[in-house]
Interface confidence: medium
């Protein structure tokens, strides 16, 4: 069973995969497809690089063209540096440009 | 073609320290973790430690008998990963790898051996 | 921490046979279905190569006479039809939790 297989098969498990668990496949060759993808929480993709995303997404990483408006894709896309989206060579335009200072919200409220 | 160059084994006394380097080609070694794993008659094979990725802050994680004593760091502009060992023991003694993430590649190994 | 235990120690087999190792882990190694279990072969003063990952998927170059199966916490490796360049050591790898570990081996000979 290939990778893509795997996903198919166990897809109704994904929507409540944690980042960590996430992190830890894009390290493990697999080959999530975009359905999938797209089923995945919000707060957990957020937090993925561009570099996980495409090792998580393998050949299937051009879908997120096609997805960039609808969540998660969106949201990750704003979260992302401009010139690392476009390492992956799809257009894919919203990220933060170049020279902007990233605030981590999330941090800033965990210490107010 | 991926490719590991690893350095720093050798004879060294109980108590005493050793830095083992493992420089990667061949692939994009920012985007992944490494590993360090060594190999013994006695233990077999044994994952020693880990290191992620800046994304992650580069957290490490450490195999429970050298936690303390071992310290996993890499230099991604350098494509390279160390193991900095102090206090070493006779069972540190062993063939250390490098491998990139769960296993696909690994280096060729340096011998350490801890004796006095 | 999660124990491989892997069984035969050692097993020879003629030329031509089907060799079945197996790995058992004390707990699942499934990471949200995919269960992340990997195969190794080590051949004397070589390192561990990578056979087969995710319990079942045959690494690229690797010869279709290796297959692995399995779920969860049962895990095999076969090998059939068992050739003379197959003689090494195999071993079995989880890397669903820190400390990964690795099984104790398993001494494929060749009669």
């Known amino acids: 069973m290939n990778g893509s297989e795997y996903f198919v098969k166990i897809q109704s498990f994904l929507g409540g995969a944690p980042t960590e668990d996430l992190k830890a496949l894009s390290q493990q060759n697999v080959s999530m497809d975009l359905a999938t993808f797209m089923k995945l929480r919000t707060d957990a993709v957020l937090p993925l690089t561009v570099a996980e995303v495409q090792k998580l997404l393998g050949p299937h990483v051009e879908g997120l063209k096609a997805e960039e408006r609808h969540r998660p894709v969106r949201d990750w896309i704003l979260r992302q540096r401009q010139d690392d989206l476009d390492t992956l060579g799809l257009g894919l335009q919203g990220g933060i440009p170049n020279g902007y200072l990233v605030l981590d919200l999330s941090m800033q409220e965990a210490l107010s | 073609e991926v490719k590991f160059e690893e350095s720093g084994g050798g004879l060294v006394q109980p108590g005493g320290s050793m830095k083992l380097s493992c420089v990667a080609s061949?692939?994009?070694?920012?985007?992944?973790?490494m590993n360090w794993v060594r190999q013994s008659p006695e233990k077999g094979l044994e994952w020693v430690a880990q290191i992620r990725l800046k994304s992650d802050n580069y957290a490490t994680h450490y195999a429970e008998s050298v936690k303390g004593r071992f310290s996993i760091s890499r230099d991604d502009s350098k494509s390279s990963v160390y193991l900095q060992m102090n206090n070493l023991r006779a069972e540190d003694t062993g063939i250390y790898y490098c491998?990139?993430?769960?296993?696909?590649?690994w280096g060729q190994g340096t011998t350490l051996t801890v004796s006095s | 921490d999660i124990v491989l235990t892997q069984s035969p120690a050692s097993l020879a087999l003629s030329p031509g046979k089907r060799a079945t190792i197996s790995c058992r882990a004390s707990?699942?190694?499934?990471?949200?279905?995919?269960?992340?279990i990997h195969w190794f072969q080590q051949k004397p003063g070589q390192p561990p190569k990578l056979l087969i990952y995710?319990?079942?998927n045959l690494e690229t170059g690797v010869p279709a006479r290796f297959s692995g199966s399995g779920s969860r916490t049962d895990f095999t490796l076969t090998i059939d039809p068992v050739e003379e360049d197959d003689v090494a050591i195999y071993y079995c790898?989880?890397?669903?939790?820190?400390?990964?570990?690795f099984g104790g081996g398993t001494k494929l000979e060749i009669k």
């Open positions: 061949g692939f994009t070694f920012s985007n992944y973790w």
């Open positions: 995710h319990a079942s």
């Open positions: 707990e699942s190694v499934s990471i949200i279905g995919t269960d992340v």
């Open positions: 790898l989880q890397s669903r939790k820190i400390p990964w570990t």
């Open positions: 491998s990139v993430g769960t296993g696909g590649y």
